[in-house]
Amino acid sequence: LEVQVPEDPVVALVGTDATLCCSFSPEPGFSLAQLNLIWQLTDTKQLVHSFAEGQDQGSAYANRTALFPDLLAQGNASLRLQRVRVADEGSFTCFVSIRDFGSAAVSLQVAAPYSKPSMTLEPNKDLRPGDTVTITCSSYQGYPEAEVFWQDGQGVPLTGNVTTSQMANEQGLFDVHSILRVVLGANGTYSCLVRNPVLQQDAHSSVTITPQRSPTGAVEVQVPEDPVVALVGTDATLRCSFSPEPGFSLAQLNLIWQLTDTKQLVHSFTEGRDQGSAYANRTALFPDLLAQGNASLRLQRVRVADEGSFTCFVSIRDFGSAAVSLQVAAPYSKPSMTLEPNKDLRPGDTVTITCSSYRGYPEAEVFWQDGQGVPLTGNVTTSQMANEQGLFDVHSVLRVVLGANGTYSCLVRNPVLQQDAHGSVTITGQPMTFPPEA
C-alpha cells in the first residue's frame, strides 16, 4: 500500500480553508467497508478525523474537518480543514489500513500577512546632529514571526542597536515592534522592512531625518545579505565595509578574511600592510580603498571548491565581523538529444530519448514536456555526475510510446543562474530515421 502526501508544507492563510492531500493505491476489488482511514496530529496522536466501518466517523477536531467522501473509493483520503487558525499549524498524519497499511505526514504551515509598518520617532522634534534618536517600526497581526530589516538611504543594512520584540495575541498572531537607536548624522533615511518568511511578503516604511552629521565610535562591519554569485573561472568580489573612526590610520587596522566553517585563513592585513593571500594565491584586497573602510576581497579564477561562507573580521579598537556567502555557478550547455532506436520508427514503438547537458553547476533541474507544453513526468530517469572540477554532466532519459507524431522537449535549468537550456526532438507518424537524413 502506497500512501502519498505532498513533500512541501501546505501553506494556508488564517481564516481560509486548507486541503491536506493524501492518497493511497486501492487494490483491485477494494471496497470502502474494508477501509480504516485515520487523520491524527503527528506529535500528540490526537484524533482529527476518521473513516471506519464503511462510513465517515466525522470530525474529532473542533468540527472543522471533512473528508471527500465521493473520492475515497478512488484512493483520495484528503482532509479539508476549515477556517484555519494559528493553532492548527503542525504535522498531520494520514494513516490508511486495508489489509496492508501505511501512513504519511503532511505539514500545515499557517500564515497571515503583516500590515504596512507605522514609524514613530522619539524624540520627534528639535533634532540636532549627534542626538541619539529612537525609531520605532510597528506592524500588526502577522504570522509566523517576522524578519525585520533596517537599512539606510543607500540600502546598506543597519544591524547594530536594533531591538525587535514580537508579541502574540490570543489568536496567535504577532504584533512586531522593532526599535532602532541611531546617532543622527548630516541627514538620513531609515527604512524598516517587515518580512513574512513564509509568504515572502514584505511590508515597508521609511522615515527621513535631516540634521548635521556627528561621528560614532563603534565599528560597523557590513557585507551583502544575499550570496555573491560567481561563474566558474571568473573573478568575484566579496564585499565588506567598515566604518572607520575619525583619525583612523591603517597602522591600527587588523583585517582578516577566513573560511567561516573551518576558520582557515584566506587573506589578512595587519601591522599597516597587506600580508598577502593564504588561499592558493588567488585573493587580493583593494589597498587604495582600505582607508575609506573598504575591506572587500577579490577572489580570482573561481572554482566550485570555493563555494561557501567567508568571514570578514575587522579590528581597530573596536572590532566586528560579518560573513558573506559565495555561490558558485556554471551554465549548462545546450542539451544534445539522442533516440534509441533511431531508425525505422513507427507509431506504437517504445523509444528512449536521452537529453544530455554538460559542465554546469550546481545540479540541474530537468523538465520534460510535450509539444503542447504539458509536463511529462512518468518514465523519466535523470542522473547527474560531477567531474574532477565539480561540474555536473546531466543525462535525462525519457521512455515514451510513439504516437502519430510528437515533439518532446527537455529543459535543463540551472537553479542559481535561473538559466534554461533546452533541446527538443520531433517525431512524425511516418517511418523515419533520427537524426533526419539530408
Partner: antibody, heavy 117, light 108 residues
Framework: EVQLVESGGGLVKPGGSLRLSCAAS????????MSWVRQAPGKGLEWVAA????????YYLDSVKGRFTISRDNAKNSLYLQMSSLRAEDTAVYYC??????????WGQGTSVTVSS | DIQMTQSPSSLSASVGDRVTITCRAS??????LAWYQQKQGKAPKLLLY???NLADGVPSRFSGSGSGTDYTLKINSLQPEDFATYYC??????????FGGGTKLEIK
C-alpha cells in the same frame, strides 16, 4: 499452507545485538504487512513492530524505537528484526505474525531471546 | 496511545459452563478488535477478527460482540481444550496495536 518460522534467538549480554529472522511461505509475502510480537516470561503479549507489504512503512513500540529495526526482503520471503542496545527487559519469546485485514491471522512458533550478563 | 483493559485477569470455570471475557479500549476503536487464544508454550491462535467474525476453523461456541470502546468474547459450553489464556488486540489507527493484559481461563 501459510508457514512462518522464526530463528536467530539466543543468549546475549546487555548492550549487545541480535538479528531475528522469519522465513515465510505459502502466501504472496509482498502483499501482506508483518509484525513482531513478544512475550516476556510469565507475561502477556506485547506488539513490538510492524512493516507494510512493500517495506516502505515501519512502526515501533516507543520503548524499542531507535534500538530495533524491522525490515523485510520480499525476494527472499523474509522478515527481520535487528535488535541492538539490548536490555534485560527485552528478554522474551519473539513471534513474527502476518497481518490480515486488521488482524494477525498467522503466527510463527517463536524464538527465545535472553538478555543477561 | 490506545490502552486495552481486559477483565477478568483470571477466571475459573467448569466444562459446560458459559464464560464472558471483556475488553475495554481507552477510546473508540470502531470494531477493529481481534481475540486470540494461547496455550502454554505455544504461539497465539486467532479466534475472532473485526470484533464479531469467527476465524476459519474456530468452533461456533466462540462468539464476539461489542462496538465503540467495549467488546466481549463469549464461550458457550466450555470444552476441555478451551482452557487457555485469551487476549484481545486493537487495530485502530497508527500503531502501537496494543494487546489487553490477558485472561487466564482455568479449570475449577
Amino acid at each position: 499452507e501459510v508457514q512462518l518460522v522464526e530463528s536467530g534467538g539466543g543468549l546475549v549480554k546487555p548492550g549487545g545485538s541480535l538479528r531475528l529472522s522469519c522465513a515465510a511461505s505459502g502466501f504472496t509475502f509482498s502483499s501482506y504487512g508483518m509484525s513482531w510480537v513478544r512475550q516476556a516470561p510469565g507475561k502477556g503479549l506485547e506488539w513490538v513492530a510492524a512493516i507494510s507489504g512493500g517495506g516502505n512503512y515501519t512502526y515501533y513500540l516507543d520503548s524499542v524505537k531507535g534500538r530495533f529495526t524491522i525490515s523485510r526482503d520480499n525476494a527472499k520471503n523474509s522478515l527481520y528484526l535487528q535488535m541492538s542496545s539490548l536490555r534485560a527487559e527485552d528478554t522474551a519469546v519473539y513471534y513474527c505474525a502476518r497481518q490480515g485485514l486488521r488482524v494477525m491471522d498467522n503466527w510463527g512458533q517463536g524464538t527465545s531471546v535472553t538478555v543477561s550478563s | 496511545d490506545i490502552q486495552m483493559t481486559q477483565s477478568p485477569s483470571s477466571l475459573s470455570a467448569s466444562v459446560g459452563d458459559r464464560v464472558t471475557i471483556t475488553c475495554r479500549a481507552s477510546e473508540n476503536i470502531y470494531s477493529n478488535l481481534a481475540w486470540y487464544q494461547q496455550k502454554q508454550g505455544k504461539a497465539p491462535k486467532l479466534l475472532l477478527y473485526a470484533a464479531t467474525n469467527l476465524a476459519d476453523g474456530v468452533p461456533s461456541r466462540f462468539s464476539g460482540s461489542g462496538s465503540g470502546t467495549d467488546y466481549t468474547l463469549k464461550i458457550n459450553s466450555l470444552q476441555p481444550e478451551d482452557f487457555a489464556t485469551y487476549y484481545c488486540q486493537h487495530f485502530w489507527g497508527i500503531p502501537p496495536w496494543t494487546f489487553g493484559g490477558g485472561t487466564k481461563l482455568e479449570i475449577k
